[in-house]
Interface confidence: low
């Protein structure tokens, strides 16, 4: 069969070879369309609720004046000419619709690199057959599944038209350090071929890259966090970042009830202050971020010290902040 | 690759009823429109029933009108076909079939067929 596409609206006109140019004429059409329940036969004399929808010419070509999602099938014609030879002509139509251009809608104005960002959505509305939606990154195709690429697609029908809406959901992950202003775009390729793509507009996202904190720096007097009973720890907060964030302080891992300060100062050392301590910095930009744990303990006249981070048990005596 | 495939047939005594059932796998099931058709032995295959891809149209075979009523369950991939009042002369294979491109164009995909036998 010859493939012929044609586009929804239009009119199409197919040839019956072997016919002779006007009546009288052998020849009979057989349809095997949606709008048919199995083959329907059309004469030249036609009439009748069909003549609406093809109708057949005086030269034997079958005229569809606007073409639907429902004259999709198979067209055969049989024709004898003057002398009693058979030609047939056999036809497979394929519609098509083009839709409008794909547009982005929500598209971000911004991404954060290093976690996973929705771009936008593309949007594709009328057309047919289906055909698919593909995004693109400076003008090269993105993957889906590939360096923290995911799409997800959604393809909708119009209850009435048959025509399709389709939509793609991007979300990606830029690299730290990557491009600052990438470029995004994306496309509709036509389900039939010999159509060419359709390109949204681009979109432009900033990419911001979050700052990398320091290390916020717990260091306990004396070292080790060893002290005699009776004796004073001095816990001191550094935090590198600038403004000075607010320093909060941990023990056993409960936020002790005290004012912020960088310093935590431990006087007249009782087996109620023994525990875990850690200090926990709070930058307006970047949430909280909190330092290793340290271990305070007491250790009675001849023992040995034991080493800064073991654990030691609980309890909340008297507290000084500098 | 799409592929349907039908149950529910069996034997019945004329006037009894039988729900035919089609599921279909391979591609986005609720964009199609489907068709039931039968072969009795020695005959040609003829078309019983048909469902648009929304479900909100159908189309019945002048034999089987009032009688037989199909319908589909997207979520489900399934499309049923509902014989009430059954006569010795449905006796046939059932077949469903899916159409390639449109509600309307011809139907390019075949189920096996389930027989449907109905004894007087």
């Known amino acids: 069969a010859q493939n012929i596409t044609a586009r929804i609206g239009e009119p199409l006109v197919l040839k019956c070879k072997g016919a002779p140019k006007k009546p009288p004429q052998r020849l009979e059409w057989k349809l095997n369309t949606g709008r048919t329940e199995a083959w329907k036969v059309l004469s030249p004399q036609g009439g009748g609720p069909w003549d609406s929808v093809a109708r057949v010419l005086p030269n034997g070509s079958l005229f569809l004046p606007a073409v639907g999602i429902q004259d999709e099938g198979i067209f055969r014609c049989q024709a004898m000419n003057r002398n009693g030879k058979e030609t047939k002509s056999n036809y497979r139509v394929r519609v098509y619709q083009i839709p409008g251009k794909p547009e982005i809608v929500d598209s971000a104005s911004e991404l954060t690199a290093g976690v996973p960002n929705k771009v936008g959505t593309c949007v594709s509305e009328g057309s047919y057959p289906a055909g698919t939606l593909s995004w693109h990154l400076d003008g090269k195709p993105l993957v889906p599944n590939e360096k923290g690429v995911s799409v997800k697609e959604q393809t909708r029908r119009h209850p009435e038209t048959g025509l399709f809406t389709l939509q793609s959901e991007l979300m990606v992950t830029p690299a730290r350090g990557g491009d600052p202003r990438p470029t995004f775009s994306c496309s509709f390729s036509p389900g039939l071929p010999r159509h060419r793509a359709l390109r949204t507009a681009p979109i432009q996202p900033r990419v911001w890259e979050p700052v990398p904190l320091e290390e916020v720096q717990l260091v306990v007097e004396p070292e080790g966090g060893a002290v005699a009973p009776g004796g004073t720890v001095t816990l001191t907060c550094e935090v590198p970042a600038q403004p000075s964030p607010q320093i909060h302080w941990m023990k056993d891992g409960v936020p002790l009830p005290l004012p912020p300060s960088p310093v935590l100062i431990l006087p007249e050392i009782g087996p109620q202050d023994q525990g875990t301590y850690s200090c926990v910095a709070t930058h307006s930009s970047h949430g909280p971020q909190e330092s290793r744990a340290v271990s305070i303990s007491i250790i009675e006249p001849g023992e040995e010290g034991p080493t800064a981070g073991s654990v030691g048990g609980s309890g909340l005596g008297t507290l000084a902040l500098a | 690759e799409v592929q349907l495939v039908e149950s529910g047939g069996g034997l019945v005594q004329a006037g009894g009823s039988l729900r035919l059932s089609c599921a279909a796998s391979?591609?986005?099931?609720?964009?199609?429109?489907m068709g039931w058709f039968r072969q009795a032995p020695g005959k040609e295959r003829e078309f019983v029933a048909g469902?648009?891809?929304?479900?909100?149209?159908?189309l019945y075979a002048d034999s089987v009108k009032g009688r037989f009523t199909t319908s589909r369950d997207n979520a489900k991939n399934t499309v049923y076909l509902q014989m009430n009042s059954l006569k010795p002369e449905d006796t046939a294979n059932y077949y469903c079939?899916?159409?390639?491109?449109?509600?309307?164009?011809?139907?390019?995909?075949w189920g096996q067929g389930t027989q449907v036998t109905v004894s007087s």
């Open positions: 079939a899916e159409k390639q491109g449109a509600d309307w164009a011809p139907y390019d995909y």
């Open positions: 391979g591609r986005i099931f609720n964009n199609y429109a």
């Open positions: 469902i648009s891809w929304s479900g909100d149209s159908t």
